[in-house]
């Protein structure tokens, strides 16, 4: 029978800068029942506080509701593990809510094949930002990424859409059924999960030659951009 091993706070996430949750990994329990508590103080403050809600985020978590969340303060937190033989503390973690935002996936993904008479056919993709995000305040800039692939293909084709909530894609295989998904991230945060897949059947007469595949931004309203490997790496840095 031993004191508990050192716990580790391994993740903090906020869906919208208004609330956030942190999770920890227990260390070894020393063969005894172990209690965990998370304590914190904020930058410029020496008064210590305890986690306000150990329930909402599930086991080994601390949830900070609206009345405990401030964008303008760094939180300095640690977890204490205690059993009959003693205590151990995690390392301190510094948390700035601005940098831990992971939004919900975008909503209302709609995909449509457009075949205008006077122009090349294209796939039109449209979506809405997640409901928890209030873009009107100006606190948020959301960036979007689309991925699509034929149903039986292994590799996804990825397109970066910037801040737009619609996108056009021209280079598709006729007669194939495609899966389309979209995700988002704030300028200083983490990518959301991908939205549920939407399926679209590409008509057999959706044809174009190779010269048509490279189309100017002007033609597309600036909506399709070629992305370098470096860009992709940057957009996936979280």
């Amino acid at each position: 029978q031993l004191p508990p091993g050192k716990p580790e706070i391994f993740k903090c996430r906020s869906p919208n800068k208004e609330t956030f949750t942190c999770w920890w990994r227990p260390g070894t329990d020393g063969g005894l029942p172990t209690n965990y508590s998370l304590t914190y103080h904020r930058e410029g403050e020496t008064l210590m506080h305890e986690c306000p809600d150990y329930i909402t985020g599930g086991p080994n978590s601390c949830h900070f509701g609206k009345q405990y969340t401030s964008m303008w303060r760094t939180y300095i937190m640690m977890v204490n593990a205690t059993n009959q033989m003693g205590s151990s503390f995690s390392d301190e973690l510094y948390v700035d809510v601005t940098y831990i935002v992971q939004p919900d996936p975008p909503l209302e993904l709609a995909v449509e094949v457009k075949q205008p008479e006077d122009r090349k056919p294209y796939l039109w993709i449209k979506w809405s930002p997640p409901t928890l995000i209030d873009l009107k305040t100006g606190w948020f800039t959301l960036l979007y990424e689309i991925r699509l692939k034929p149903e039986k293909a292994a590799e996804w084709e990825i397109h970066f859409a910037g801040q737009q909530t619609e996108f056009k894609i021209l280079s598709l295989h006729p007669g194939q059924k495609y899966l389309v998904q979209v995700r988002c991230k704030p300028d200083h945060g983490y990518w959301s999960a991908w939205s549920p897949a939407t399926f679209i059947q590409i008509p057999s007469d959706f044809t174009m030659n190779d010269e048509q595949k490279l189309i100017s931004e002007e033609d597309l309203g600036g909506e399709q951009k070629l992305i370098s490997e470096e860009d992709l790496h940057h957009h996936h840095h979280h």
């Epitope: 403050e45 020496t46 210590m48 506080h49 305890e50 809600d53 150990y54 204490n80």
Partner: antibody, heavy 118, light 107 residues
């Protein structure tokens, strides 16, 4: 609607003991930091004790340290202050206060009067 | 402990006038700072927290400013119900402390 109702005040002789209670309703008591604050005509408002959501963090003012004990029962939405070795200078109205916004107490009870006199 | 000094001790003004109350801390409290209003026989009522944020239900005529050691509560146009005692408070460090109060009275 939030309610904090203190009870247990009264007249006690110097050296005596009292136990104050605060019954909370209208909010998730178990999530909130709770406090006892007292007010005397001479000293104004004095923050005397603070207890965190699961009693992990407890603070006392030097003027009451070793004599007063704060505790809470989250199952019963209740806050307590056990006051021993009371002195004349402990005479005051005692308020319980719930912290709701970044550690600022927004909810206060109406207070209970404690008089220490022989 | 951090000592808070309020000035003036008493402020005599008429309804409709602007009130400016000051509070100075003996050391920096960042912006962990609040203002309370108290009327006779009542508990203190939170007006401003984090130096400049209005608490729920507080009229817009109340505003707070300052950080570090110097803080101000401004009431832009006094209403009859604003005449009361006002306390500043720091909760940057334990013990949490209050100022001695400013009495705002009708002239």
């Amino acid at each position: 609607e939030v309610h904090l109702v203190e009870s247990g005040g009264g007249l006690v002789q110097p050296g005596g003991s009292l136990r104050l209670s605060c019954a909370a309703s209208g909010f998730t008591f178990s999530s909130y930091e709770m406090n006892w604050v007292r007010q005397t005509p001479g000293k104004g408002l004095e923050w005397i004790s603070h207890i965190s959501s699961r009693s992990v963090i407890i603070y006392y003012a030097d003027s009451v340290k070793g004599r007063f004990t704060i505790s809470r029962d989250n199952a019963k939405n209740s806050l307590f202050l056990q006051m021993n070795s009371l002195r004349a200078e402990d005479t005051a109205v005692y308020f319980c206060a719930g912290i709701t916004i970044f550690g600022i107490p927004e909810y206060w009870g109406q207070g209970t009067l404690v008089t220490v006199s022989s | 402990e951090i000592v808070l000094t309020q000035s003036p001790a008493t402020l005599s003004l008429s309804p409709g006038e602007r009130a400016t109350l000051s509070c100075r801390a003996s050391q920096s409290v960042s912006s962990y700072f609040a203002w309370y209003q108290q009327k006779p026989g009542q508990a203190p009522r939170l007006l401003i927290y984090d130096a400049s944020s209005r608490a729920t239900g507080i009229p817009t005529r109340f505003s707070g400013s300052g950080s570090g050691t110097d803080f101000t509560l401004t009431i832009s146009s006094l209403e009859p119900e604003d005449f009361a005692v006002y306390y500043c408070q720091q909760r940057s460090s334990w013990p949490i402390t209050f100022g001695q109060g400013t009495r705002l009275e009708i002239k």
